[in-house]
Amino acid sequence: SGTEASVVAPPPVVLLPDVETPSEEDCMFGNGKGYRGKRATTVTGTPCQDWAAQEPHRHSIFTPETNPRAGLEKNYCRNPDGDVGGPWCYTTNPRKLYDYCDVPQCAAPSFDCGKPQVEPKKCPGRVVGGCVAHPHSWPWQVSLRTRFGMHFCGGTLISPEWVLTAAHCLEKSPRPSSYKVILGAHQEVNLEPHVQEIEVSRLFLEPTRKDIALLKLSSPAVITDKVIPACLPSPNYVVADRTECFITGWGETQGTFGAGLLKEAQLPVIENKVCNRYEFLNGRVQSTELCAGHLAGGTDSCQGDSGGPLVCFEKDKYILQGVTSWGLGCARPNKPGVYVRVSRFVTWIEGVMRNN
């Protein structure tokens, strides 16, 4: 399979302002936690009470003093607690403590990499034995399919035009036309109307034959609340031992519940020195790979999850640290899964993206 060699840093991932970024427009991003507009009436038209006032409602939790960065000035609608219902205020109706405000979404919402708009379930466990994910809570998850529509590998959206996957997923054919990607899906079949199906225009295999590859899409994905890229790590970053990360996929569930729906599992990273011990993977794991899994077994990535993401939460976003690669069986005791260490390939990835 031809290595169209070369490398990449995403074109600024049409990543729209962080939902936490204060917005003075009279519209909001996401749940409006960063809304700083001047609407001051509730959905019923009732004027809002000043955040600093104690009439008609006494309160002490959401005041300008207790939340100095929440924009609680005057009586403007705000969302200091990140309520899923959006901006709200205490009302001037003595019989109604609070109500929501009618703040529209900004016309072109922008979504930052690694920040799902649906909070993940965060299931402690693995995909074999993990749990069904909340729909669209892992919005960078890609289903890599044959041109006839059969799912055979996972992938990760890293920019509107680029998907990262495992090189071994592309062994069957060197032709981009053999593949297509599905974005924004939760069900493996019966695809929902918002799902994006995009052809692949080019394949790039990592030149030193590591199990990582890039797919260039024939047209850019539309970034929506259901389709958001994952963030790339800093070059050569090493995920700390025992960091809890998440794997996702539609792969083989070995009889556990949830086949056909996107599953997730939480796994600790195991440092290579430990993973390479005799009783575990006995020296098979390279420095360009990382291990993750419960040594007791029971949770793991499996066939069909290959090429998919292992993401780790850092500060306020999910970062793509691994590409599902190989394992000795699935979810076996003392046999953690092995993932390509993405940070070792960021320079290559960014180069390919930049030059193509």
Epitope: E119, K121, K122, C123, P124
Partner: antibody, heavy 124, light 107 residues
């Protein structure tokens, strides 16, 4: 075994603030979301608040929103509930509850373990 | 959020199968079932996330969901199952609610 021990209840004065603490043991506290649910005398269950495993997401029930805050300390395995400006209708038993998952979502559907509860009486 | 609807009471003879339904949560909602033996005593989780049963719960309790209705099934009711059963429902964009409770009487 999972153990959730609530404290901080008792007789409370209207208009004052209530602070409840739940001490957890028997599981990896930092991997799971935690919730507070209350039950007024002779009534059903009511969701009060929830917080995800790392404290970055919170959710609040409609009846207490604007008067409540939930927080957690993963080092000490405790979750706290502060309820402001107490009213007579806040009287009831407050239960600390563990989610089966790490996300703050869906307390009424995802709770897999409960504390014994602490009784709160708001009266002058 | 609209209230959940569950029957106020059901009764059964020992050994019979009982189904308690809960509706009103929406097609994308998740459901849980909780048993309370007496007022003020701590609830016990029977089912969470539609179908999952905690390891300490007998297998005669099972949960299912079809559309926006969840069902708790007790196969082979026993005298000790006499209690109030609450359903709870939520989805990823709401805080969620509980039903008013169903009293199960074992005849």
């Amino acid at each position: 075994a999972v153990t959730l021990d609530e404290s901080g209840g008792g007789l409370q004065t209207p208009g004052r603030a209530l602070s409840l603490v739940c001490k957890a043991s028997g599981f990896t506290f930092s991997s799971y979301a935690m919730h507070w649910v209350r039950q007024a005398p002779g009534k059903g269950l009511e969701f009060v608040a929830g917080i995800d495993n790392i404290g970055s997401y919170t959710r609040y029930g409609a009846a207490v929103k604007g008067r409540v805050t939930i927080s957690r300390d993963n080092g000490q395995s405790i979750v706290r509930l502060q309820l402001d400006n107490l009213r007579a209708e806040d009287t009831g038993t407050y239960y600390c509850a563990k989610s089966a998952y790490g996300g703050s979502c869906c307390g009424p559907a995802y709770i897999d373990a409960w504390g014994h509860g602490t009784e709160v009486i708001v009266s002058s | 959020q609209a209230a959940l609807t569950q029957p106020s009471s059901v009764s059964a003879n020992p050994g019979e199968t009982v189904e308690i339904t809960c509706s009103g949560g929406g097609r994308s909602s998740y459901y849980g079932w909780y048993q309370q033996k007496s007022p003020g005593s701590a609830p016990v989780t029977l089912i969470y996330d539609n179908t999952n049963r905690p390891s300490n719960i007998p297998s005669r309790f099972s949960g299912s969901k079809s559309g926006s209705t969840a069902t708790l099934t007790i196969t082979g009711v026993q005298g000790e199952d006499e209690a109030v059963y609450f359903c709870g429902s939520a989805d990823s964009s709401t805080t969620g609610i509980f039903g008013a409770g169903t009293t199960l009487t074992v005849l």
